[in-house]
């Protein structure tokens, strides 16, 4: 029979490559049986996970699972790092695996060539 423990479905060593400036939703899939647990997000700083206060979060309910979502609107370069969600269930703290966001800063990653550079490289126009 299926366990009635709360389970957090974040894959171990999961990663997301995202762009600074874009919106992004980081999902924590939560399986529970009766009462929805209290869920929070934290960001890893070394070995400690710092709770994310004052961040926009929301719930999305689906048939067999619920998603606790951390919103990035927009993604900032310093959002780079590892995140974990945790659920309080019957006085127990259940922690997910951590998931890592790799943020590409579009400005530094894909600086457009200047007009001078374009002029010196006419083959780029074709």
């Amino acid at each position: 029979k299926e366990s009635c423990d709360v389970q957090l479905y974040i894959k171990r060593q999961s990663e997301h490559s995202i762009l600074a400036g874009d919106p992004f939703e980081l999902e924590c899939p939560v399986k529970y049986c009766a009462n929805r647990p209290h869920v929070t997000w934290c960001k890893l700083n070394g070995t400690t996970c710092v709770k994310l206060e004052d961040r926009q979060t929301s719930w999305k309910e689906e048939k067999n699972i619920s998603f606790f979502i951390l919103h990035f609107e927009p993604v900032l370069p310093n959002d780079n790092g590892s995140y974990r969600c945790s659920a309080n269930f019957q006085s127990n703290l259940i922690e997910s695996h951590s998931t890592t966001l790799y943020v590409t800063d579009v400005k530094s990653a894909s600086e457009r060539p200047s007009k001078d550079e374009m002029a010196s490289r006419p083959w780029l126009l074709y």
């Epitope: 389970q7 479905y9 894959k11 171990r12 999961s14 070995t47 695996h97």
Partner: antibody
């Protein structure tokens, strides 16, 4: 019934490319990581890399980086291994394996695809 | 890369024997969640590998209880308590704690 069914044996010439498929069924591919493993004739197992079908994120072993491309199409529950610029030394059995990503509760292997590279 | 060293490389034993295969990693396999991601696989000639044990000591469903795994940190053991004819095969340890994931070189278990 859980199955990982790989595409059939291939014979290729040096310099050619090849894409091997691994069709999964009996579980949700998005809940897993798909690994690819090489076994040269009479030798041990070598990890090539893995793909997260849920978001496309891929990790490669440095030994294979640039030589192979791993991908998946979650809509048809199929993973792929592409081998480019084939050499005789790429002759081997290639296996896909699907490991549950959350709690490692299952680890299934495909039957293998034998690739022979010969001029 | 983490080196996985299995010993012995080959082993002759008889049906009913107790057999132990060891696997040593060049660094700890303890992940930050406190678990060691160490698998044992069995491969028979001409067949695909099959996972027997994961997370050091958890048996896959359908795997006979004569197989057991133990260990921590860098030293791990696969034990077969009473060898059966179908157990003669090659056994591999595989770590999936640290990238790139790595296998041991294999231990070939043969009939004496």
């Amino acid at each position: 019934e859980v199955q990982l069914v790989q595409s059939g044996a291939e014979v290729k010439k040096p310099g050619e490319s090849l894409k091997i498929s691994c069709k999964t069924s009996g579980f949700n591919i998005k809940d897993t990581y798909i690994h690819w493993v090489r076994q040269m004739p009479g030798k041990g197992l070598e990890w090539i890399g893995r793909n997260d079908p849920a978001n496309g994120n891929t990790k490669y072993s440095p030994s294979f980086q640039g030589q192979v491309t791993i991908s998946a199409d979650k809509s048809i529950s199929t993973a792929y291994l592409q081998l480019s610029s084939l050499k005789a030394s790429d002759t081997a059995m290639y296996y896909c394996a699907s490991y549950e990503g959350y709690y490692e509760r299952f680890g299934y292997w495909g039957q293998g695809t034998l690739v022979t590279v010969s001029s | 890369d983490i080196q996985m060293t299995q010993s012995p490389s080959s082993l002759s034993a008889s049906v009913g024997d107790r057999v132990t295969i060891t696997c040593r990693s060049s660094q700890s396999l303890l992940d930050r969640d406190g678990k060691s991601y160490l698998n044992w696989l069995q491969q028979k000639p001409g067949k695909a590998p099959k996972r027997l044990i994961y997370l050091v000591s958890k048996l896959d469903s359908g795997v006979p209880s004569r197989f057991s795994g133990s260990g921590s940190g860098t030293d791990f053991t696969l034990t077969i308590s009473s060898l059966q004819p179908e157990d003669f095969a090659t056994y591999y340890c595989w770590q999936d704690t640290h990238f790139p994931y790595t296998f041991g070189q294999g231990t070939k278990l043969e009939i004496k």
